[in-house]
């Protein structure tokens, strides 16, 4: 659900963190219409997720901690 590298909507699925290698934050005030977390998967897919949802917050914190510990 993205266009010109902007997410236009969110996935309906809950992704397991074991499939995710990183993420990018999309901010609505920086040229895109909505705030989003773009998850990057092991299969080189980009998935747009709602940053307000609990499962997304957990994965963002998990990945952020991994980067800090590297």
């Amino acid at each position: 659900a993205s266009n010109f590298d902007c997410c236009l909507g969110y996935t309906d699925r809950i992704l397991h963190p074991k499939f995710i290698v990183g993420f990018t934050r999309q901010l609505a005030n920086e040229g895109c219409d909505i705030n989003a977390i773009i998850f990057h998967t092991k299969k080189k897919l980009s998935v747009c997720a709602n940053p307000k949802q609990t499962w997304v917050k957990y994965i963002v914190r998990l990945l952020s901690k991994k980067v800090k510990n590297m």
Epitope: Q53, W55, Y58, I59
Partner: antibody, heavy 120, light 110 residues
């Protein structure tokens, strides 16, 4: 009707650990996270951390990092919170609460709470 | 130390309306939804409002929530004696990656 049933009251010595359980009676954890919240006598609510059982991934509040361990057993729909190096300031009621994975962190179902008393 | 600030106490007579405020910052209330919890003495908290202004089933429509910028409010109209309780606001904080509760407000129905 789903209920969160917590283990019974505990009295612990300073420096020891306590492990509190929380079972989803009449339901499962499949689309929920479980948070742990404590309340010292006469004080406010304090989020300690939470876990998404289907992920096996826990988040901890910075204040409790390194001292709290939250786990879950999907097969029995039971979550656990273990707090170590107990001090008198850890005397509190410990609640487990449920939040939808697709919601925005609202805790829509709570256990009745487990009183943990730390005393020498 | 919570970064969501509420007045320690509010009071009003039965039938009146009361507003409880909750002040935060961009990283919590400003960017996330707010929920409100009611707690009677010796009881577990109960969700009263979520997603700023939605009510779970069973919560009377006398309870309503709103948000403006980095602050949120809980309005209780037509006060009843059973509304006397502690009320807590809460929101996720993106900077801390933690769920925050407000300092709590004791509502007294005079």
């Amino acid at each position: 009707e789903v209920q969160l049933v917590e283990s019974g009251a505990e009295v612990k010595k300073p420096g020891s650990s306590v492990k509190v359980s929380c079972k989803a009676s009449g339901g499962t954890f499949s689309s929920y996270a479980i948070s742990w919240v404590r309340q010292a006598p006469g004080q406010g609510l304090e989020w300690m951390g939470g876990i998404i059982p289907i992920f096996g991934t826990a988040n901890y509040a910075q204040k409790f990092q390194g001292r709290v361990t939250i786990t879950a057993d999907e097969s029995t729909s039971t979550a656990y919170m273990e707090l170590s190096s107990l001090g008198s300031e850890d005397t509190a009621v410990y609640y487990c609460a449920r939040e939808s994975l697709t919601g925005d962190s609202e805790l829509d179902l709570w256990g009745k709470g487990t009183l943990v008393t730390v005393s020498s | 130390q919570s970064v969501l600030t509420q007045p320690p106490s509010v009071s009003a007579a039965p039938g009146q309306k009361v507003t409880i405020s909750c002040s935060g910052s961009t990283s919590n209330i400003g960017n996330n939804y707010v929920s409100w919890y009611q707690q009677h003495p010796g009881k577990a908290p109960k969700l009263m409002i979520y997603d700023v202004s939605k009510r779970p089933s069973g919560v009377p429509d006398r309870f309503s929530g709103s948000k403006s910028g980095n602050s949120a409010s809980l309005d209780i109209s037509g006060l009843q004696s059973e509304d006397e309780a502690d009320y807590y606001c809460a929101a996720w904080d993106d900077s801390l990656s933690e769920f925050l509760f407000g300092t709590g407000t004791k509502l007294t129905v005079l």
